[in-house]
């Protein structure tokens, strides 16, 4: 058993049929010594008396809010949550496996630049009695500070018969050094509590590996005289790190016909313009990627050819 | 060329070669041997490799103030990785795949280090740790980790040279 926060405790249980469970001793936070009784949740049934209560925790029915009283007055509470371990593996029932970029990916994180600011998100089908708390640091043995806000519900989607809820959190490294080569990864830890079930999820990454620039902005076409060619131009997204002579992007320009089956013409360039042939009913799209480190491409910015 | 004591490097040449190094480091990564990338292990990359850190003056302001500190750090790293690529880790069994551009990567590391420090000039170089894994699978794992950290190292070096070519070239 360990303390998650004041008066909230997590009991770690090996979860299998007829498991013996864990013996837990609760102590009433009071100077009183006599006349103390214990109850669980809303029940008035007295579970025991005395300053301490010993219980055998085997299942969710044994978890909940234990309260010690004296003469009708509440002295203190202890909330017991269960953390299940099945076949040596901690349960992951609360969050959905996003399976990207690999199986068992519950947390996904992205950064728009090298400022040390990043966003993580996760999915669940649970709509009520759900709380999250997020902590983060750079490195684990001698951790350096990363400040995370509160997790918020950021999207709701209908997937077949189910509703899916997306939660996200923003974090900022306290003393970020955008130009340095990271040697210690960022660690993100999410505590999830659903009713009386506790689970924790972690992710470890370098900012450089989660970079995904915003799409190029101000995408414009300029027809070239007496030609089917057009000059496409664009700008770096506002959110990208500066100066651009140091934090450079590379771009992929694509001409795509209306039908997905039509041949795509693609050009790679480090410049912020390119000359392409504009076919009728086609569209021109541009996306960006860090020029020197192959993290994610941005989403496409597009304009029609017409 | 970056000569100890201080004249400027051939920023544009360094920019071109460092950008080439970035491509080579990425293209070499899947081709250092048959291995499922998921087996790579999530623990930190070999801690002995040199990193370009916050105080090394490789940020835009530091380069403007005095690029020599940063260039020396980059030079040390290039020599370090060049020696690793020539070591038993990469030359031993299991053999690199035939398609692997590690030879080009090796030559380019040496080429860039020579651009930064011509013959006859000497900066201190970092000791190469004796990383000699006994098992072939350990060697394979180490190759992946070395190439992963090399990708990060050359990305910073390429930014330095791109910025230098754009703002510090005579």
């Amino acid at each position: 058993i360990w303390e998650l926060k004041k008066d909230v405790y997590v009991v770690e249980l090996d979860w299998y049929p007829d498991a013996p469970g864990e013996m837990v001793v609760l102590t009433c936070d009071t100077p009183e010594e006599d006349g103390i009784t214990w109850t669980l949740d809303q029940s008035s049934e007295v579970l025991g008396s005395g300053k301490t209560l010993t219980i055998q925790v085997k299942e969710f029915g044994d978890a909940g809010q234990y309260t010690c009283h004296k003469g009708g007055e509440v002295l203190s509470h202890s909330l017991l949550l269960l953390h299940k371990k099945e076949d040596g593996i901690w349960s992951t029932d609360i969050l959905k496996d996003q399976k990207e970029p690999k199986n068992k990916t519950f947390l996904r994180c992205e950064a728009k630049n090298y400022s040390g600011r990043f966003t993580c998100w996760w999915l669940t089908t649970i709509s009520t009695d759900l709380t999250f708390s997020v902590k983060s640091s750079r490195g684990s043995s001698d951790p350096q500070g990363v400040t995370c806000g509160a997790a918020t519900l950021s999207a709701e989607r209908v997937r077949g018969d189910n509703k899916e809820y997306e939660y996200s959190v923003e974090c900022q490294e306290d003393s970020a050094c955008p130009a340095a080569e990271e040697s210690l990864p960022i660690e993100v830890m999410v505590d999830a509590v659903h009713k009386l079930k506790y689970e924790n999820y972690t992710s470890s990454f370098f900012i450089r590996d989660i970079i995904k620039p915003d799409p190029p902005k101000n995408l414009q076409l300029k027809p070239l005289k007496n030609s089917r060619q057009v000059e496409v131009s664009w700008e770096y997204p506002d959110t990208w790190s500066t100066p651009h002579s140091y934090f450079s992007l590379t771009f992929c320009v694509q001409v795509q016909g209306k039908s997905k089956r039509e041949k795509k013409d693609r050009v790679f360039t480090d410049k912020t313009s390119a000359t392409v042939i504009c076919r009728k009913n086609a569209s021109i799209s541009v996306r960006a990627q860090d020029r020197y480190y192959s993290s994610s491409w941005s989403e496409w910015a597009s304009v029609p050819c017409s | 060329r970056a000569v100890p004591g201080g004249s400027s490097p051939a920023w544009t040449q360094c920019q071109q070669l460092s950008q080439k190094l970035c491509t080579l480091a990425w293209s070499a990564h899947p081709l250092v041997g048959h291995m499922d990338l998921r087996e790579e292990g999530d623990e930190e990359t070999t801690n002995d490799v040199p990193h370009i850190q916050c105080g090394d003056g490789c940020d835009p302001q530091g380069l403007r103030d005095n690029s020599q500190f940063c260039l020396q750090r980059i030079h040390q790293g290039l020599i370090f990785y060049e020696k690793l690529l020539g070591s038993d880790i990469f030359t031993g069994e299991p053999s690199l795949l035939p398609d692997s551009p590690v030879g080009q990567l090796h030559a380019s590391l040496l080429g860039l280090s020579q651009l930064l420090q011509p013959e006859g000039h000497h900066w201190e170089t970092q000791q190469i740790p004796s990383l000699s894994p006994s098992q072939p699978w350990q060697r394979l794992l180490l190759r992946f980790k070395i190439l992963r950290s090399l990708q990060a190292f050359v990305a910073v070096a390429a930014r330095v040279f791109a910025h230098g070519a754009a703002t510090l070239s005579p």
Epitope: - | L24, W26, S27, P101
Partner: antibody, heavy 116, light 107 residues
Framework: QVQLVQSGAEVKKPGASVKVSCKAS????????MTWVRQAPGQGLEWMGQ????????DYNEKFEGRVTMTTDTSTSTAYMELRSLRSDDTAVYYC?????????WGQGTLVTVSS | DIQMTQSPSSLSASVGDRVTITCRTS??????LAWYQQKPGKAPKLLIY???TLAEGVPSRFSGSGSGTDFTLTISSLQPEDFATYYC?????????FGQGTKVEIK
Amino acid sequence: QVQLVQSGAEVKKPGASVKVSCKASGYIFITYWMTWVRQAPGQGLEWMGQIFPASGSADYNEKFEGRVTMTTDTSTSTAYMELRSLRSDDTAVYYCARGGGGFAYWGQGTLVTVSS
Amino acid sequence: DIQMTQSPSSLSASVGDRVTITCRTSENIYSYLAWYQQKPGKAPKLLIYNAKTLAEGVPSRFSGSGSGTDFTLTISSLQPEDFATYYCQHHYGIPFTFGQGTKVEIK
């Protein structure tokens, strides 16, 4: 299995251009360099250049610089080599080969004849 | 550019003979050397890479050795199908260059 299939033979006049294609299958196209090598009749092998499809980054033999362009179409896993301002001594078999080191996989070759 | 000097330019040998072809480079290329076999009208076939590693499907009578600037291809017991032209190629930095070839003919 890995296969590289090249376009058919071409006959060109001096000063013209030729574009040879090489369609790859059996592997992840963007992960490997594609190299072009040529061989004049009765002569040895000559490295022309290479391209990395994931980024479009290309390197050329200085001998061909300015006359050769290598491109790829990642949507069809096809590499292209265009040689311009053809001369009679460009008559050769042009090969694509996979990789940026030793070449384990080669196309069948495309004979380009330059003759007036 | 790295120069490749292959010798001999041609040799005559009989089935069962031990054949040795050498390749010398103008500068240190570590072990970044490949050997190819080419038959008329066909694309080259990779035999050895990284100086000594046998390519997939290549008979064990072929072997490679050397590092730095001096390399050797050995055919321990020449077979009828081995009569062909052999090329060395370095893959240490661009431009890659090939040796001028060694034609192995029937004595």
